[in-house]
Interface confidence: low
């Protein structure tokens, strides 16, 4: 089992909307959860969009989940990684970071 | 599952505040959501707040959001609540809860602290 | 807010008996994502509540098999096919759908 690396990213949406990406990379088995949780609930399927689980050439995969919010109430949303049992909860960076 | 160890009980005066902490350990504290809850002797719950303790963000009951304040402290894998302007109807039981959640299930409250006991008395 | 109604209030009952906990809330309790977020804890006197059952029918870790969850939008309801003495005590349901979540008035399982 390699545990995937995963990173959030937030970019400009709409006026007053954000954005925010998360990236799990260089994990395997291809098998994982990724999904974004505002207040510790996961959001509805429609309001995300999945990338495919791709192989990543070094005999591991990548994906990324994506959202759009307000601006201002990032820290309401986490990025929620669950892969070979093991699970991880991660925050939308800060604007400068 | 991991502790959830509260502090000892307090007896405090009218109108002031006491600063109640919840000492977690056995899990990675910063991937979790702690909530704090109220129960008055021989009476139901009531959920006051949670806070997650990955960026100290927070959602409070509109009850509670003048008289309860959610801090954590990352480096003793801490939550701390606050509670002010205290009045007889605060002495109550406090206790912390560990939410508990897979992918697209959860459990809100799955592991309690012991409570703490507070009394509110001129 | 949301309001959970429990019944009976208490549920005196003989060891061995199946007993049925209801509850109701007042309004749909499911969350925009589909899901229900309705749980059930017994709280035993001087312990903290534990957690038995998640989003409505789902035994939490360690939860005898004779604890069983039900119900779908407003009603919902605990079974408990064989009562033994360590499953007396107060039980309270509870949804975490709407904000503020809530919890119901308890039902006090005893013995007859």
């Known amino acids: 089992t390699v545990p995937p690396m995963v990173n959030v990213t937030r970019s400009n949406a709409s006026e007053g909307n954000i954005t925010v990406t998360c990236r799990a990379s260089s994990f395997y088995p291809r098998n994982i959860i990724l999904t974004w949780r505002q207040d510790n609930v996961s959001l509805s399927n429609d309001t995300q969009q999945w990338g495919d689980v791709l192989p990543d050439g070094n005999g591991t995969y990548q994906t990324w989940v994506a959202t759009r919010i307000c601006r201002g109430e990032e820290q309401n949303f986490t990025c929620y990684m669950e892969h070979s049992g093991n699970h991880s909860t991660h925050p939308v960076p800060s604007n400068g970071s | 599952q991991g502790q959830m160890q509260q502090s000892g009980a307090e007896l405090v005066k009218p109108g002031a505040s006491v600063k109640l902490s919840c000492k977690t350990s056995?899990?990675?504290?910063?991937?979790?959501?702690i909530s704090w809850l109220k129960q008055k002797p021989g009476q139901s719950l009531e959920w006051i707040a949670w806070?997650?303790?990955?960026?100290?963000?927070?959602s409070y009951n509109q009850k509670f959001t003048a008289k309860a304040q959610l801090t954590v402290d990352t480096s003793s894998s801490t939550a701390y609540m606050q509670f002010s302007s205290l009045t007889t109807e605060d002495s109550a039981i406090y206790y912390c809860?560990?939410?508990?959640?897979?992918?697209?299930?959860?459990?809100?409250?799955?592991?309690w602290g012991q409570g703490t006991l507070v009394t509110v008395s001129a | 807010d949301v309001l959970m109604t429990q019944t009976p209030l208490s549920l005196p009952v003989s060891l061995g008996d199946q007993a049925s906990l209801s509850c109701r809330s007042s309004?749909?309790?499911?969350?925009?994502?589909?899901?229900?977020?309705l749980e059930w804890y017994l709280q035993k006197p001087g312990q903290s509540p534990k957690l038995l059952i998640y989003k409505v029918s789902n035994r939490f870790s360690g939860v005898p098999d004779r604890f069983s969850g039900s119900g779908s939008g407003t009603d919902f309801t605990l079974k408990i096919s064989r009562v033994e003495a360590e499953d007396l005590g107060v039980y309270y349901c509870?949804?975490?759908?709407?904000?503020?979540?809530?919890f119901g008035g308890g039902t006090k399982v005893e013995i007859k």
């Open positions: 509870f949804q975490g759908s709407h904000v503020p979540w809530t």
């Open positions: 309004q749909n309790i499911v969350h925009i994502n589909g899901n229900t977020y």
């Open positions: 809860a560990r939410h508990d959640y897979y992918g697209t299930s959860g459990a809100w409250f799955a592991y």
């Open positions: 056995g899990f990675t504290f910063s991937d979790n959501y």
């Open positions: 806070i997650y303790a990955g960026t100290g963000g927070t």
